[in-house]
Interface confidence: low
């Protein structure tokens, strides 16, 4: 039951069986903490008092790896190490493609200690923003023949694990490639910023004119982008052209971290852009094109200085990074 | 083209250190990392240790009471310093570099260190 | 710390035959594990990394699978250039170890 969490974890990619089973879990908001020590993860699960009670943590010892820390009949707080290795969690030889499906497989398909379901999520206190995200400040292509990705200044990454040595696997919001990068080229960025920053199709920066003004002449019939609600902070709309005019679609997070549109339920608003691709968004339209950030939209000032960064790593030229 | 390149002393005294420069091109020590394994004769390889890009280090615990590694970037050299010399440290010493995350996938010539009085 | 351990510690196969080692772990390290080659006098050579993932340059002939503790990597039609020793390495965290080695010998 209890783990080291002291241990140095790496590795690119895994070929363990994976469980593919439709499984429901809380949200992501009622049981994971973030990072967290060891010692208050027990004392937040002795307070909520039930055997059963659960939450995930990130451990504070090896940044990336994640325990699921779990109350016991015994009154016994035990932590289960879980791996993330390139977007997938691993625990017990079992992989999972998520958190919310390895809470949801051991809540109702199969027992983490003898006869002992996961049960009763255990929220924090606040709430938690799980997911480091960073911006690159240079360009970057990679090294042929490695697991490095290529990107350009301004891409955001989704951070899913440090590796040793300044590493990072990460996905790339822009082009949703996985790969590794290395931290010298990026930034972090600010948990006020919003999580769609880095999509090709989001416009963080715009007013509603310069969004329709933008479609008129950077787009064509069937463009579209998204940007944040004028009227209800928090929400979003989706812009989109046809032939007559400029239509707009609200879309409306939900407290379980899902996305509302025309009364239905999306996990992410790439899932509904995915959706209006292949169904008519109205009659005889799909999503076909965004209309991509464009340059006087960057939110980074162009006057970062990379030549003590590329000397640093020995980059002779932004296509050919090493000698 | 990525290449390593060891140069030592060859020949060691019992008690004292020897020292070996591994000699990088066609990567940055700022970039990646680089190992040190060992092959005694006729036997497998041992590794060693390893510094870090960022100049961190990572010993083998039967070996880190008497071994150290450093580098300079600007130099592109790794420098590796084994004390105490016991003539079952006689053997061929590697440097390697870190390819992606953990594995080595380019190895010096190896030097050949000979412990004996 | 972790130990590997492989198997046969030597084996004798002809040419174009398909031969077989395997590496067992002492406990999971996951696909975390790396085949390398080394001729007579010569340094080792990277085969296959991530346990599956072919080196650069490696012949298609060699071939790695497997994960958690049980690995194996396959020759399919062995050639006389293949003879050597083979090693697998863990670098699931330091301290990172090799195992014992496989001595391949054509017959």
């Known amino acids: 039951g209890t783990v080291d969490e002291g241990d140095s974890l790496d590795g690119p990619e895994y070929e363990e069986e994976e469980v593919a089973i439709p499984l429901t879990a809380p949200p992501t908001n009622q049981w994971y903490h973030g990072k967290l020590d060891r010692t208050i993860a027990e004392e937040r699960l002795r307070q909520a008092g039930k055997s059963g009670s659960y939450l995930i943590r990130e451990s504070d010892r090896r940044p990336g790896s994640f325990v699921l820390s779990f109350l016991s009949q015994m009154n016994v707080v035990n932590h289960f190490r879980i791996i993330a290795m390139c977007g997938d969690y691993y625990i017990g030889g079992r992989r999972f493609s998520s958190l919310s499906d390895l809470i949801g497989y051991y809540s109702h398909v199969s027992c983490l200690l003898k006869g002992e379901k996961l049960l009763y999520p255990v929220a924090p206190p606040e709430p938690v923003e799980d997911r480091r995200r960073v911006r690159a400040i240079l360009p970057y292509t990679k090294v042929p023949d490695t697991d490095e990705i290529s990107f350009l200044k301004g891409d955001m990454f989704i951070v899913h694990n440090e590796l040793e040595d300044g590493w990072m696997w990460v996905t790339n919001l822009r082009t949703d490639e996985q790969g590794l990068i290395v931290e010298d080229l990026v930034e972090e960025v600010g948990r006020e910023e919003d999580p769609h920053e880095g999509k090709i199709w989001f416009h963080g920066k715009i007013s509603k004119q310069e969004a329709y003004n933008l479609l008129m002449t950077v787009g064509q019939v069937c463009s579209f982008l998204v940007r944040p609600s004028d009227n209800t902070p928090g929400d979003y709309s989706l812009y989109f052209r046809t032939n007559e005019n400029i239509q707009r679609f609200k879309i409306c997070p939900t407290p379980n971290n899902q996305f509302m549109m025309g009364g239905r339920y999306y996990n992410s608003i790439g899932d509904i852009i995915d959706h209006y691709r292949k169904e008519q968004i109205v009659e005889g339209y799909y999503l076909k094109e965004p209309v991509p950030m464009q340059d006087q939209e960057q939110v980074l000032n162009d006057t970062v200085d990379g030549k003590e960064i590329y000397n640093t790593i020995r980059r002779k030229t932004k296509d050919a990074f090493y000698k | 083209q990525v290449q390593l390149q060891e140069s030592g002393p060859g020949l060691g005294q019992p008690a004292q250190s020897i020292s070996i420069t591994c000699t990088v091109s066609g990567f940055s020590l700022s970039s990646y990392g680089v190992h040190w394994v060992r092959q005694s004769p006729g036997k497998g390889l041992e590794w060693l240790g390893v510094?870090?890009?960022?100049?961190?280090?990572d010993y083998n615990a039967a070996f880190m009471s008497r071994l150290s590694i450093t580098k300079d970037n600007s130099k592109s050299q790794v420098f590796f310093k084994l004390n105490s010399l016991q003539p079952d440290d006689t053997a061929m010493y590697y440097c390697?570099?870190?390819?992606?995350?953990?594995?080595?996938?380019?190895w010096g010539q190896g030097t050949t260190v000979t412990v004996s009085s | 710390d972790i130990e590997l351990t492989q198997s046969p510690a030597s084996l004798s196969a002809s040419v174009g035959e398909t031969v077989t080692m395997t590496c067992r772990a002492s406990?999971?390290?996951?696909?975390?594990l790396a085949w390398y080659q080394q001729k007579q006098g010569k340094s080792p050579q990277l085969l296959v990394y991530?346990?599956?993932k072919p080196g650069n340059g490696v012949p298609s002939r060699f071939s790695g699978s497997g994960s958690g503790t049980q690995f194996s990597l396959k020759i399919n039609s062995l050639q006389p250039e293949d003879l050597g020793n083979y090693y697998c390495l863990h670098f699931y965290g330091t301290p990172y170890r090799f195992g014992g080695g496989t001595k391949l010998e054509t017959k």
């Open positions: 406990e999971n390290i996951y696909s975390n």
């Open positions: 510094i870090w890009r960022g100049g961190g280090t």
């Open positions: 991530a346990a599956t």
């Open positions: 390697a570099k870190r390819g992606g995350p953990g594995y080595f996938d380019v």
